[in-house]
């Protein structure tokens, strides 16, 4: 019998209101054993996958998706979904990214060795 998969959660670091040119990292969370996390835009045809999964807690896994330099085109709703064999989960709630600008780019904190690097969403993955 297939298990019921909990809905993933989505959050953004450092928040959901981001100055133009700054970075944002979306964090998707699900149960242990998730093979693929997917970050989707409002249209399901634009998404990014990762199998680079970490422990968030003894009972949770997480994946991070970083956009290094936010533009107006990055504004809008995002949600997470995951694949835990043999099926995909439901989608998370939407998280709305707001881009503030034009403003001066804040001081760059990319020298933090723990900060994830850039990975923007691409529209090349279609269902």
């Amino acid at each position: 019998q297939e298990e019921d998969l909990p809905r993933p959660s989505i959050s953004a670091e450092p928040g959901t209101v981001i100055p133009l040119g700054s970075h944002v990292t979306f964090v998707c969370r699900g149960p242990v054993g998730v093979q693929t996390f997917r970050l989707e835009r409002e249209s399901r045809s634009t998404y990014n996958d990762t199998e680079d999964v970490s422990q968030a807690s003894p009972s949770e896994s997480e994946a991070r998706f970083r956009i290094d330099s936010v533009s107006e085109g990055n504004a809008g709703p995002y949600r997470c979904i995951y694949y835990k064999p043999p099926k995909w989960s439901e989608q998370s709630d939407y998280l709305e990214l707001l881009v503030k600008g034009p403003t001066q780019r804040p001081s760059d904190n990319s020298h933090n060795e723990h900060a994830p690097a850039s990975q923007g969403l691409k529209a090349e993955h279609l269902y």
Epitope: V32, G33, Q55, A117
Partner: antibody, heavy 119, light 107 residues
Amino acid sequence: EVQLVESGGGLVQPGGSLRLSCAASGFTFNINAMNWVRQAPGKGLEWVARIRTKNYNYATFYADSVKDRFTISRDDSKNSLYLQMNSLKTEDTAVYYCVRDRAGFFAYWGQGTTVTVSS
Amino acid sequence: DIQMTQSPSSLSASVGDRVTITCLASQTIGTWLGWYQQKPGKAPKLLIYAATSLAEGVPSRFSGSGSGTDFTLTISSLQPEDFATYYCQQLYSTPLTFGGGTKVEIK
């Protein structure tokens, strides 16, 4: 079909250096963390090093036994994983496996390359 | 570092036997545990991930149970191809440590 093919093993003297390579195919290399695991003759498995993806700034992690001597790296444009081994010791003699990390677990293994450190 | 203690280190069994291998973590790891099978001269193969999930292509006679610190790998009916060495591994925190292995031999 997922394939991980290691190369670069061989005989080296104590204190010497060696660079292992792993050619990956059959999957989207740049979305997976990757690892090196070794197995000394007649012994168990020992995790050596791990490298994460661009989303994590290619963060690296090492076993204490190899820290400051070994360096893991990757070239996503070449679908390749590397292990630079310096200041080699006799206890580094082992079969070295390239391992694809999936869901945090070691889902796919190469067939291994043998490193012998001896004078 | 999290220590993984596997027992027994070896066992003798016959085809058709039910075999149980245990793994004890020195601190709680939730279900961040994998089980691997290794045959002589071959690379290890993932059997179970997330403590209880069967890896792709693995026969259903293999099963995993447990969470926290105590874990079990069970082979419900041992087959000739199952004679091998089995390892547990915690993937909760680095260093990603393995158990010492359990060699399953023919009685």
